[in-house]
């Protein structure tokens, strides 16, 4: 029975040209995490395998950095990076857990303007 839950950073926004950390956390299960996949739409961005460590997609190796932890850092953001990102935890014996993050990449001035109205 799958008892675990995934907590994510939820909906986030970042500035064009900047960087952002995508984070997920699996809790409420004793299952062993064997691999974490980071995906955007149907594209595999990166893998963190328990035995083999991090592997980054050849298409994204200049803009994606592993970590911190099992998270993923996206760099040199463009408006095209806006969209859904998924962390997929492969575990034993539970199976697969999936978390969703929505990233909106904003033009610099919009991101700055929006920041003024954030509730502390």
């Amino acid at each position: 029975m799958m008892t675990g839950t995934i907590e994510t950073t939820g909906n986030i926004s970042a500035e064009k040209g900047g960087s952002i950390i995508l984070q997920c956390h699996l809790s409420s299960t004793t299952a062993q995490v064997t691999q974490v996949n980071w995906e955007q739409q149907d594209q595999l961005l990166a893998i963190c395998n328990a035995d083999l460590g991090w592997h980054i997609s050849p298409s994204f190796k200049d803009r994606v950095a592993p970590g911190p932890g099992l998270g993923l850092t996206l760099q040199s953001l463009t408006v095209n990076d806006t969209g859904e990102y998924f962390c997929i935890y492969h575990t034993y014996p539970d199976g697969t857990y999936t978390g969703r993050i929505f990233l909106e990449v904003l033009e610099s001035s919009v991101a700055e303007h929006g920041a003024r109205f954030q509730i502390p």
């Epitope: 064997t34 691999q35 595999l44 035995d51 592997h55 492969h90 014996p93 199976g95």
Partner: antibody, heavy 120, light 110 residues
Framework: EVQLLESGGDLVQSGGSLRLSCAAS????????MTWVRQAPGKGLEWVST???????YYADSVKGRFTISRDNSKNMVYLQMNGLRAEDTAVYYC??????????????WGQGTTVTVSS | QSVLTQPPSASGTPGQRVIISCSGT????????VNWYQQLPGTAPKLLIY???QRPSGVPDRFSGSASGTSASLAISGVQSEDEADYYC???????????FGGGTKLTVL
């Protein structure tokens, strides 16, 4: 849509060689282990070889030293070089995709197979 | 001889519940996920159950899987004539460093 298309099967003399190819499409090929499974006429499925995303290789004892699995991530191709073929290698050879970068997960997609016939 | 043990045949009448067993060892079923494949006559195998009990999209919910210890089973509740096929269990074997399959079970719908 994930697709695997095998080719290279043929009729060959005992002791001969063949190279099977598998063209993959519809997924981020670099991030998944690939496997060859065979099925002799009227028999069950038999694992032949697996290659992880980082090119770690695994072989069944029955083919070790005779068969070589390889992959070209830039071309989305996996190959099986078969040398020293024997009559008992006669089978339909299936190319299959794993759900993980490494191994021990689930073979989730199969090609339609290519037929190898070894005559003695 | 297959590493995983399955009955060679199983049968049922339409609407009946059919269970196919698969027995292994600690190094395969006991420590890794079990998969079930359906192979219709003249076609390639198709994933039916993965990670012991998960169904891929498109697989009818009459198919279910379970695993405990070193054994697994596939249940077909309300078997139908189109379910007539060969069924294989499989798991990664950590000692052999390879996939192991059951010998297959031929399901006949009477």
């Amino acid at each position: 849509e994930v697709q695997l298309l095998e080719s290279g099967g043929d009729l060959v003399q005992s002791g001969g060689s063949l190279r099977l190819s598998c063209a993959a499409s519809g997924f981020s090929f670099w991030g998944y282990a690939m496997t060859w499974v065979r099925q002799a006429p009227g028999k069950g499925l038999e694992w032949v070889s697996t290659i992880a995303g980082n090119s770690y290789t695994y072989y069944a004892d029955s083919v070790k030293g005779r068969f070589t699995i390889s992959r070209d991530n830039s071309k989305n191709m996996v190959y099986l070089q078969m040398n020293g073929l024997r009559a008992e290698d006669t089978a339909v050879y299936y190319c299959a995709k794993d759900r993980s970068f490494y191994n021990y997960y689930d073979i989730d997609v199969w090609g339609q197979g290519t037929t190898v016939t070894v005559s003695s | 001889q297959s590493v995983l043990t399955q009955p060679p045949s199983a049968s049922g009448t339409p609407g009946q519940r059919v269970i196919i067993s698969c027995s292994g060892t600690n190094s395969n079923i006991g420590s890794n996920h079990v998969n079930w494949y359906q192979q219709l006559p003249g076609t390639a195998p198709k994933l039916l159950i993965y990670t012991n009990n998960q169904r891929p999209s498109g697989v009818p919910d009459r198919f279910s899987g379970s695993a405990s210890g070193t054994s697994a089973s596939l249940a077909i509740s309300g078997v139908q004539s189109e379910d007539e096929a060969d069924y294989y269990c499989a798991a990664w074997d950590g000692s052999l460093n390879g996939w192991v399959f059951g010998g297959g079970t031929k399901l006949t719908v009477l």
